[in-house]
């Protein structure tokens, strides 16, 4: 498992090319999904086939901003949705207490460097209780694919490690020890420690979220400025697991 974590973390270290040629990335989404009224649903997007650095992900419903995950500032949820929207898993978004009014198009907008903006579309249909039982099936292809990819990668790594161990047992010992130490170090990130490239972490400079401790004029200015955003951070979102 440590090897897996290390591999995923290492993906985030890939250097983006200096000049953008063509946008090669693709966004896989959960597609058209349906869910039960009163229930919850996970909106998931996955950016792949690019080495571009993800700097921010916006979630929008039609032209309304639901949430932002910023590499420096962490998660921020719109005030009109803060009781019903939860960040994650990953860069996804969880919608709770669904109503029929939640039916519609949702967009994940990946801001990347140097490629630019990638947009994924999900159509959500909120159904009355009994009709929605088949809804979860729509999510299986993407989540299954992601899980399968991880399993394949982990298996490949384990096989390679096992074979290499047989051939070069002594050398692997020292290398593995070193990697294990690095891996353990990454599991112990603290807010004061520099975060790895692409991780979406709450910035130390703004511990109370985008408003900081200035609850008055500055927050009012930000609310007016953004119309829809509530500036309280909701923790971390990891970009480095996202590009494949």
């Amino acid at each position: 498992m440590r090897w897996c974590l290390l591999l995923i973390w290492a993906q985030g270290l890939r250097q983006a090319p200096l000049a953008s040629g063509m946008m090669t990335g693709t966004i896989e989404t959960t597609g058209n999904i349906s869910a039960e009224k009163g229930g919850s649903i996970i909106l998931q997007c996955h950016l792949s086939s690019t080495t571009a650095q993800v700097t921010q992900v916006n979630w929008e419903q039609q032209d309304q901003l639901l949430a932002i995950c910023n590499a420096d500032l962490g998660w921020h949820i719109s005030p009109s949705f803060k009781d019903r929207v939860a960040p994650g898993p990953g860069l996804g978004l969880t919608l709770q207490s669904l109503t029929v009014n939640d039916t519609g198009e949702y967009f994940c907008i990946y801001h990347t460097y140097p490629d630019g903006t990638y947009t994924g579309r999900i159509f959500l249909e909120v159904l009355e209780s009994s009709v929605a039982e088949h809804g979860a099936r729509f999510q299986i292809p993407l989540l299954g694919a992601m899980a399968a990819t991880l399993v394949v990668i982990c298996t490949a790594v384990i096989v390679v490690v096992a074979l290499t161990r047989k051939k070069k047992a002594l050398r692997i010992h020292s290398v593995e020890g070193d990697l294990r130490r690095k891996s353990a170090g990454q599991e112990e990130w603290s807010p004061s420690a520099p975060s790895p490239p692409g991780s979406c972490v709450q910035a130390e400079a703004a511990p109370a979220g985008l408003c900081g401790e200035q609850r008055g004029e500055d927050c009012a200015e930000l609310h007016d400025y953004f119309n829809v955003l509530s500036y309280r951070s909701l923790g971390n979102c990891s970009f480095f697991t996202e590009t494949g």
Epitope: I68, A206, D218, Y225
Partner: antibody, heavy 119, light 107 residues
Amino acid sequence: DVQLVESGGGLVQPGGSRKLSCAASGFTFSNFGMHWVRQAPEKGLEWVAFISSGSSSIYYADTVKGRFTISRDNPKNTLFLQMTSLRSEDTAMYYCARMRLDYYAMDYWGQGTSVTVSS
Amino acid sequence: DVQITQSPSYLAASPGETITINCRASKSISKYLAWYQEKPGKTNKLLIYSGSTLQSGIPSRFSGSGSGTDFTLTISSLEPEDFAMYYCQQHNEYPWTFGGGTKLEIK
């Protein structure tokens, strides 16, 4: 009120250096990405450099890459542009601008500071 | 880089009229185009971003439309204070690029 005030401009010789500053007030500086944009005499606007709120992302225009360095001091609410190996074509009015939180559009601009590169 | 061609470069109109300014991108920039107003002695002002979203505090006579490569800024019922320089900027991808500008003058 959001305010951005640039300083540090002036006359510089070709090959010389200059450091521009942008003092920000009226908002939580550490939460916003910042841009430098310039405008040569009788010309249009040209984006120069960008730095994200926590300095994790820094980008430059090809015309200044390797010569200019953008940085920020969040506790002091100040943005910087260190310019080296200056050329006559760098002569321009330099503006700092705040990035919107959601997109790379620039929602507040300073008045600008003038840099003239000439011998 | 994305080239932005702005037209016309010069426009004369009278207060009360409706005018349009166009920007064309050399490749698709989705909806990510912003419009700015530049006036002597004042700081540049963001009018529209993401193609059609009105920036807070900007009068509703300003509107933006378009997506892909073709975008339009419309100012309906021109006010005396609207006569200024206008620029468009793509904020879709690095490096961010501007149009050449449109000077709007009183006829």
